[in-house]
Interface confidence: low
Amino acid sequence: NECPKLQPPVYGKIEPSQAVYSFKDQVLVSCDTGYKVLKDNGVMDTFQIECLKDGAWSNKIPTCKIVDCGAPAGLKHGLVTFSTRNNLTTYKSEIRYSCQQPYYKMLHNTTGVYTCSAHGTWTNEVLKRSLPTCLPVCGQPSRALPNLVKRIIGGRNAELGLFPWQALIVVEDTSRVPNDKWFGSGALLSESWILTAAHVLRSQRRDNTVIPVSKEHVTVYLGLHDVRDKSGAVNSSAARVILHPDFNIQNYNHDIALVQLQKPVPLGAHVMPICLPRPEPEGPAPHMLGLVAGWGISNPNVTVDEIILSGTRTLSDVLQYVKLPVVSHAECKASYESRSGNYSVTENMFCAGYYEGGKDTCLGDSGGAFVIFDEMSQHWVAQGLVSWGGPEECGSKQVYGVYTKVSNYVDWLWEEMNSPRAVRDLQVER
């Protein structure tokens, strides 16, 4: 009772291979790497058949079908392209993931190339079966920032897209006395986070308590150029308002805060994040030049006291910017502590401006980023936040602007943005 000789399937083999198969002999059909046994529409690794008493095989020889990894998964902020003709998704086919350049880049700098494996999964040499992550590119505006700025105060109009991280923060707080509406600036750190000064988001009560404004009272505008025309801007409400826990209203120490946006903003030519500095306590070196932008007061002939007393809002319609040098801590400390009034320039602050005055940040610019170009990484970095200045006219002689030293807070920012309290788990490029 011999069974007929078996022909192995294409791309497969039969074991054991014998000249003659008799009753009760069994053979195992398996396929080459990258192929699977196909039997009755079912896919399996191997298939066993037996020689029966009547000299027939228990089943027909199955076919070997090439492994198909199927359509690759979509990538958030990225796209997938097929390297193999006819968009094949079968064994050894290749695909390439890439991020939406120039606004996103791939984490870990992987090639993004995935191959359809014998197991039926798209696999990358480094990431294995995990998909790559597209992170926002920070500190690289699509329009190159200028090297020189002539004589904010002594500033000039910014062209659209020069400061794509710049945010306008509008606060309407019913608990504020006497005014219930004010504004400041901020800087986009990722699709969902805005960096700003704590004093911009502190509920302005009569006493010195530090209470954040209610998130319902905060609106953030991104991609804004002219405040008279908000049509092209992205506006977002706040999901969380986080002031530094040790912000001191008396001396503005730890003047730093975060706003988590209600939903991530789409990045583009006019909306891109700024980079955070390395966590170093030195902060920016004296004489380094930085840029600051804002919609604050640009009239150099008005004093801060006059503005506050009159309650007027002489803000600039078009975003202004100015280039300022960092001033040594000792010089700044001396310039303030020699004045009447209780000024304290702490290690969490640095100063910028010109001894002769003429260029400065002013009321309404608060919370905006003081950015410096980092030659090593070729990115713009938020080294400071507009914090405070003396009571004289903005841009007065030997009255430097005081900025929060962001490098002292990188770990706190990181902790807050990645904390379980955050509305959703977000990765922030560091």
């Epitope: 530094h244 826990p245 040790d246 001191n248 120490n253 730890h254 390395r278 966590p279 306590p281 702490t346 290690e347 969490n348 002292n408 807070y409 990188v410 770990d411 706190w412 990181w414 902790e415 990645n418 904390s419 560091r430």
Partner: antibody, heavy 120, light 107 residues
Amino acid sequence: QVQLKQSGAELVRPGASVKLSCKASGYTFTDYYINWVKQRPGQGLEWIARIYPGSGNTYYNEKFKGKATLTAEKSSSTAYMQLSSLTSEDSAVYFCARNYYISSPWFAYWGQGTLVTVSS
Amino acid sequence: DIVMTQSQKFMSTSVGDRVSVTCKASQNVGPNVAWYQQKPGQSPKALIYSASYRYSGVPDRFTGSGSGTDFTLTISNVQSEDLADYFCQQYNRYPLTFGAGTKLELK
């Protein structure tokens, strides 16, 4: 230069309390967190809590809540940690440590440590 | 709490050798790891912060690397004064946690 000088060794009875001190010099005391760290003989380090002397704000490791109480005296630039209801498990060297800079919770400056021995 | 695991309690080395002390975090801690050296009867001394930044005054034979969950402190050209306990610490989440330590000793 920055210095943290801790109080001397303590021998205390079980159930009693002890108050350790850490006197800071060479920097603005109110501008930096002071942390307390426990090290049992031949063992690793355990973070207990931190205090921000500028505001008195404290943050405790859940494990040490009710055991340790942190305070700070601005006038003398001194931080204190009181340990209560002592048991043999509390026998350890306790270090005070200051952050390198304000927000970063790793420690560039350490006190010399205070040995606490709980024994009857 | 985040657990920092230093799997090697002891490591033997010789003067002039290169040695790597490893530390594994139970969850992603980004780059927020510091390394300390402690000699008997002394308080710990900071060596590395933010995973790879050398603290001022630390000899350049000490280097740190890693991000996420796996971190390494490498001492190239080991000197006799490097024989000590080495601890890693994460500061991505409170409570701050330390590894149990790795003792570096002479072969």
